[in-house]
Amino acid sequence: QEGNHEEPQGGLEELSGRWHSVALASNKSDLIKPWGHFRVFIHSMSAKDGNLHGDILIPQDGQCEKVSLTAFKTATSNKFDLEYWGHNDLYLAEVDPKSYLILYMINQYNDDTSLVAHLMVRDLSRQQDFLPAFESVCEDIGLHKDQIVVLSDDDRCQGSRD
């Protein structure tokens, strides 16, 4: 799906609704290990005024806390600014609003720069269909297959999704 690194044709509003996290990847494995700062799970998204609002689930103290975050639009169409555990340049990589979404973030925390990628799907029963696309994006942006974590159904936040 080369060349599809931009906002969906119908606008960001098409991204609104429920999503499920399927896989994470990072060059810093600690960020996406259990209890890592980017071991977070999408619950839903909405768009307003060109900004992306997301409700995410964060494992905390044996439970899952729902947190609302906003990724603010920038002058670059597929780039957003997100403040979460430092500053993040968030980019939409591949977007099929009815099926799946791949995004990547360049995180800057103090003097440390990290790369994190996230695969989310509308329908969890089809998650296997989109893992090859995620692996391909990861390889292209500099993340190897062994840096990908595929999330399992018994993940801590699975029960909190609905």
Partner: nanobody
Framework: AVQLVESGGGLVQPGGSLRLSCVAS????????MGWYRQAPGNEREFVAV???????HYANSVSGRFTISRDHAKDTAYLQMNSLKPEDTAVYYC??????????????WGTGTQVTVSS
């Protein structure tokens, strides 16, 4: 190794535009990300923008919305379209080949640079 040659620099007034080119020769660069960096006198080399083989990008916040990176695989060339130039964009601009999107991530090769001067 990949040999990288930058061109397109010059003197431009504030608010003006330039388009830099980086031609790769030798081994194919098409499996690498290609990045643009710059270095002003007395400063360290800093990241500007990078584009992967499939076209995924990352921009420094200081140039986001003004600069656009692109590449032409058939010509083994990367471009940096620079609009709304400011005096603080004055620097020698370098391109490189690298292993991914992260600034300075596993850099393979550097070009020799092209001077951009923004002044009235």
């Amino acid at each position: 190794a990949v040999q990288l040659v930058e061109s397109g620099g010059g003197l431009v007034q504030p608010g003006g535009s330039l388009r830099l080119s980086c031609v790769a020769s030798g081994s194919s660069s098409r499996n690498y990300a290609m990045g643009w960096y710059r270095q002003a006198p007395g400063n360290e080399r800093e990241f500007v923008a990078v584009i992967t083989s499939r076209g995924y990008t990352h921009y420094a916040n200081s140039v986001s919305g003004r600069f656009t990176i692109s590449r032409d695989h058939a010509k083994d060339t990367a471009y940096l379209q620079m609009n709304s130039l400011k005096p603080e964009d004055t620097a020698v601009y370098y391109c490189n080949t690298q292993a991914g999107l992260l600034p300075f991530m596993t850099v393979y090769d550097w070009g020799t640079g092209t001077q951009v001067t923004v002044s009235s």
